[in-house]
């Protein structure tokens, strides 16, 4: 903490300007009025403060706004944003996309993924849902940031907005996020023709259930192996050899390359070796001939 001292009369600050770069830390602490700083935040980013001086300014704002900064201050934080922790940001209420854009620009090139994720979260909460304008802002200024949101936040995306999401925006999404986004995409694109539909739905398929994957296998989509490898393990395991062959089309040869990786490896273990042999790829590890397969998932129907 910066120690408290009295401000010398000649150092009294009446406006935020470049003269402040010559103030020592304790002079800034003593002489800058927090309310004045807040009122003139738009000037701060133009002044080449050291990181140490920025620490003092942040401390002043923290004292003035212990419950979190107002958006009028947040909008003009500039490089002071680099000093914020996720805990600080969690206290904010942000509704303006201009504020979001400004801070995303500042964070570029800095290791601030946690802060950015928290900021986006606050914007979604502040705006009530992840609307098209917010998604457009994220895709333009922070590719991949969509996937920093929790599944709970992503659930507020209206299906109508899904069309604005690009494949690269989903690269870092995990299964739980795709579980939320996939059904929305399926609803959003359902009026498209088969081939156009597949192009649109492909980036979201990591959230698809088995029956959707089976249906795709009937549509000559020739799924690329990268997409196949991103499918849920649980969605792939029930597929037959014939269904996988139809699904991948000419890309089926790639199974050999991915033989040791999930979900291909797990799928191979569930297939009859005879069936795997029909692919002519030399895939090994299937169930030997003569073995009985008991599907325990249907045990209730048998009892």
């Amino acid at each position: 903490d910066v120690e408290r001292t009295t401000c010398p009369p000649e150092k009294e600050v009446h406006e935020i300007d470049e003269s402040l770069i010559f103030y020592k830390k304790r002079e800034l602490e003593a002489c800058v009025d927090a309310a004045l700083l807040a009122a003139q935040m738009d000037r701060v980013d133009a002044i080449p403060f050291t990181y140490e001086q920025l620490d003092v300014l942040k401390h002043k704002l923290d004292e003035l706004y212990p419950q979190g900064y107002p958006e009028s201050v947040i909008r003009h934080l500039g490089h002071l944003f680099l000093k914020m922790s996720p805990e600080d940001i969690r206290k904010w209420n942000v509704t303006s996309l201009e504020t979001l854009k400004a801070l995303l620009k500042v964070s570029k090139g800095h290791e601030m993924s946690a802060q950015v994720a928290t900021l986006i979260d606050r914007v979604v909460v502040g705006r009530g849902q992840l609307d098209k304008d917010t998604v457009d802002t994220l895709t333009a200024f922070c590719p991949g940031c969509l996937c920093s949101l929790s599944p709970e936040r992503l659930s507020s995306v209206p299906p109508s907005v899904i069309g604005a999401v690009r494949p690269q925006d989903l690269d870092t999404c995990g299964p739980r996020q795709l579980d939320v986004l996939y059904p929305k995409a399926r609803l959003a694109f359902q009026n498209m023709s088969g081939s156009e539909y597949f192009v649109k739905i492909r980036p979201f398929l990591g959230g698809a259930p088995t029956e959707d994957v089976k249906a795709l296998s009937q549509q000559n989509v020739s799924m690329d192996l990268a997409t196949f490898m991103k499918l849920r393990r649980e969605a792939v395991l029930p597929l037959t050899v014939a269904e996988v062959q139809k699904l991948l089309g000419p890309h089926v040869e790639g199974l050999k390359v991915e033989e040791q990786h999930s979900p291909v490896r797990d799928w191979i273990l569930k297939q009859r070796q005879d069936d795997l042999d029909t692919l002519g790829l030399g895939l090994q590890g299937g169930i030997p001939n003569g073995y009985l397969i008991l599907d325990l998932s249907v045990r209730e129907a048998l009892s």
């Epitope: 299964p175 739980r176 579980d179 939320v180 609803l187 009026n191 539909y197 259930p209 249906a215 969605a235």
Partner: antibody, heavy 122, light 107 residues
């Protein structure tokens, strides 16, 4: 073939929580989306919400603040909890399977449970 | 939300005759419409999806038509087992919504 069976108390007191479970037999819960739909006596159908086996849900905004849908893949079951019930929540509650095929791309229901009547009364 | 309105509320038709049931959406639902049949004490049964495609096992006397906001379910020659309540459902957007139903009764 796949069958659905709803279970739970037939009588719930006002302001309490209605709890129902749907057991999926004859197939895996992992392959589809699963919904709850209700029908007040003598009235039409109302979609409550769906769940995916991973736990991802979506529910009707008119009920969202009171609805929790959960899943137990080990038991091949999914459940509905509806809090702060009133007499207006008296209905036959159905669990249903969303057809889940891209070939027909839709959110409609090709398989239903028989339904269970839940009465809200003190 | 999209409001689905069915008409008439009750339709009286003699066996062997044609029945025409209507369903109107408050905004376009494209062809994302399903029809269900419900008999007393039973769960609904899927008849039609995609506005005009018959579900598995549904007799050819059931047909659906329409797109956008106006839809029709036609039963060409009524059998005794067809007297029931019929519901339309849109799945163009969430929340999924149903019509209030049309009761088809014997004249």
């Amino acid at each position: 073939q796949v069958q659905l069976q709803e279970s739970g108390p037939g009588l719930v007191k006002p302001s309490e929580t209605l709890s129902l479970t749907c057991t999926v037999s004859g197939g895996s819960i992992q392959n589809y989306y699963w919904s709850w739909v209700r029908q007040p006596p003598g009235k039409g159908l109302e979609w409550i919400g769906y769940i995916f086996y991973s736990g991802s849900t979506n529910s009707n905004p008119s009920l969202k603040s009171r609805v929790i849908i959960s899943v137990d893949t080990s038991k091949n079951q999914f459940s509905l909890k509806l809090s702060s019930v009133t007499a207006a929540d008296t209905a036959v509650y159905y669990c249903a399977r969303e057809v889940g095929r891209i070939a027909v791309a839709g959110w409609f229901f090709d398989l239903w449970g028989r339904g269970t009547l839940v009465t809200v009364s003190s | 939300e999209i409001v689905m309105t069915q008409s008439p509320a009750t339709l009286s038709v003699s066996p062997g005759e044609r029945a025409t049931l209507s369903c109107r959406a408050s905004q376009s639902v494209n062809s994302n419409l399903a029809w269900y049949q419900q008999k007393p004490g039973q769960a609904p049964r899927l008849l039609i999806y995609g506005a005009s495609t018959r579900a598995t096992g549904i007799p050819a006397r059931f047909s659906g038509s329409g797109s956008g906001t106006e839809f029709t379910l036609t039963i060409s020659s009524l059998q005794s087992e067809d007297f029931a309540v019929y519901y339309c459902q849109q799945y163009n957007n969430w929340p999924l919504t149903f019509g209030q139903g049309t009761r088809l009764e014997i004249k």
